[in-house]
Amino acid sequence: GDMLIEKTIKREVVLEEGTTAFKNWVKTGTTVYRQFWIFDVQNPDDVAKNSSKIKVKQRGPYTYRVRYLAKENITQDPEDHTVSFVQPNGAIFEPSLSVGTEDDNFTVLNLAVAAAPHIYQNSFVQVVLNSLIKKSKSSMFQTRSLKELLWGYKDPFLSLVPYPISTTVGVFYPYNDTVDGVYKVFNGKDNISKVAIIESYKGKRNLSYWPSYCDMINGTDAASFPPFVEKSRTLRFFSSDICRSIYAVFGSEIDLKGIPVYRFVLPANAFASPLQNPDNHCFCTEKVISNNCTSYGVLDIGKCKEGKPVYISLPHFLHASPDVSEPIEGLHPNEDEHRTYLDVEPITGFTLQFAKRLQVNILVKPARKIEALKNLKRPYIVPILWLNETGTIGDEKAEMFKTQVTGKIK
């Protein structure tokens, strides 16, 4: 009995035409939503003039349906037992699951103004940029609609720059009609313990963003893992959103629609400083903002974002050091709401439910040559938004799963 089940599982989790895994892998049967909460700044003038604490109030959720598009350019390579693909990006607004419309306005950091002196550190250049910022009537903060903030708007300051640069700015710009990849993953045909593990991303085995082993692309994309998952295992996966590989550890056993699953959680030490977790030393790439690598809970992903001062954290700076959250008022980190977890069915290794939570922040620093920023007395890592991307196996699929997998084992 057990041998037969194991044999069936091994056959059905292979990523090739005709298997259960392949069908769900090409186009997920799960409806995936991405909820956004925007941090609306309540005291923009006070901050710009007096370098006060930034008072924020989160507004949301604003919900989009994502990951509804099938993988494309799927190519099997029988030589090395891999399958390559790209994942198209798309987002559809869901008004019924949102607190308002895409036209709702928010006061947020001016992304272009904040980034300019970070990207252009030369003082001559900053003088030129300052004149363009003033000419465009831009300031430290701006009011933007949800749609503009997420998906892009023509920036008035950048529109005055005489160089052929992109003048469109948005937290996720460009998104619709773009693809993530190329991913090349092992199909498991020769070795089931490697199924879905990423062999390369964008044609490379390393990211070129981090020094040393931090730069490695480890594990799967978290949608599934090699079968027969044990509680003692550390699940490693790569997330292009945060430009790094990360890991999850066993948290608890739960029942998901009658299916026993293991809940794997991202541990706090994944975001720890090198002082607390020496393994993280290569994720600390600069010494000033990180207070000589003693700060924790934020990840500088600028190298992955064309040098823009983008920092990723958990929502509300959960698991972040006090120095990071001290200049911001209105944050209420909460483990249940703000942590990331994966509910993995241990026999197949399929992720049947997940919640990916992360926050996008922008660093803004005092800049003597930029009038909009010259009154700042300290750097701020400014929260822009946080997101909760969730997916749960549908009732019908769950029944089918129980019949075909867990039911047979019982």
Epitope: I119, Y120, N122, F124, V125, V161, P162, Y163, G307
Partner: antibody, heavy 119, light 112 residues
């Protein structure tokens, strides 16, 4: 003082590729755009494109987009231009030139690299 | 593309004379940010071009004050008040207001 030292003359066959280098010294390499300019024999100058070493951002003259690829190696303060699918039309002197600080002028130029494409 | 037309093609002068080179663009060089990115370069025989004037009328550091630039919109002029031997070469105007940035065809300043 600012200096841009370009690689030596190149003689290549049609259809081949070539990579020209420009080593910068005397300033912070990552702070300034680096431009490339073409001068065909006895002719005027043509702007090819630029690269910003800080983040590798590029801007191209559309005419050269499929001909030239601009890259940098910040560790050695060197800018590179690769020219591909070479024809006799690509025979020229190629200059690297430093941006003067965001006012679209070139304040320092390399000595030029002569490229000859001939079978 | 913006076409930059320089006149004359060749300018024979005597040392000590005044020289004037004209540059006309096929469209206005006033950028949407209000600046006019019209610059002048000199290329001496066997050398790389050198910047003389930037943004119509600003002399680059080390450039003698006998060089001056003027103009607006589509019409620009470079003047050399008293030509010296070291001024001989080809003068190019350049526009950086519209991508792709373009150079004029050049004006050769030579001894009469």
């Amino acid at each position: 003082d600012v200096q841009l030292q370009e690689s030596g003359p190149e003689l290549v066959k049609p259809g081949a590729s070539v990579k020209i280098s420009c080593k910068a010294s005397g300033y912070t390499f990552t702070d300034y755009n680096m431009h490339w300019v073409k001068q065909s024999h006895g002719k005027s100058l043509e702007w090819i494109g630029y690269i910003y070493p800080y983040n590798g951002g590029t801007g191209y003259n559309q005419k050269f987009k499929s001909k030239a690829t601009l890259t940098v190696d910040n560790s050695s303060s060197t800018a590179y231009m690769e020219l591909r699918s070479l024809t006799s039309e690509d025979s020229a002197v190629y200059y690297c030139a430093r941006d003067g600080g965001y006012d679209v002028y070139f304040d320092y130029w390399g000595q030029g690299t002569t490229l000859t494409v001939s079978s | 593309d913006v076409v930059m037309t320089q006149t004359p093609l060749s300018l024979p002068v005597s040392l000590g004379d005044q020289a004037s080179i004209s540059c006309r663009s096929s469209q206005s060089l006033v950028h949407s940010n209000g600046n006019t990115y019209l610059h002048w370069y000199l290329q001496k025989p066997g050398q790389s071009p050198k910047l003389l004037i930037y943004k119509v009328s600003n002399r680059f550091s080390g450039v003698p004050d006998r060089f001056s630039g003027s103009g607006s919109g589509t019409d620009f002029t470079l003047k050399i008040s008293r030509v010296e031997a070291e001024d001989l070469g080809v003068y190019y105007c350049f526009q950086g207001s519209h991508v792709p940035w373009t150079f004029g065809g050049g004006t050769k300043l030579e001894i009469k």
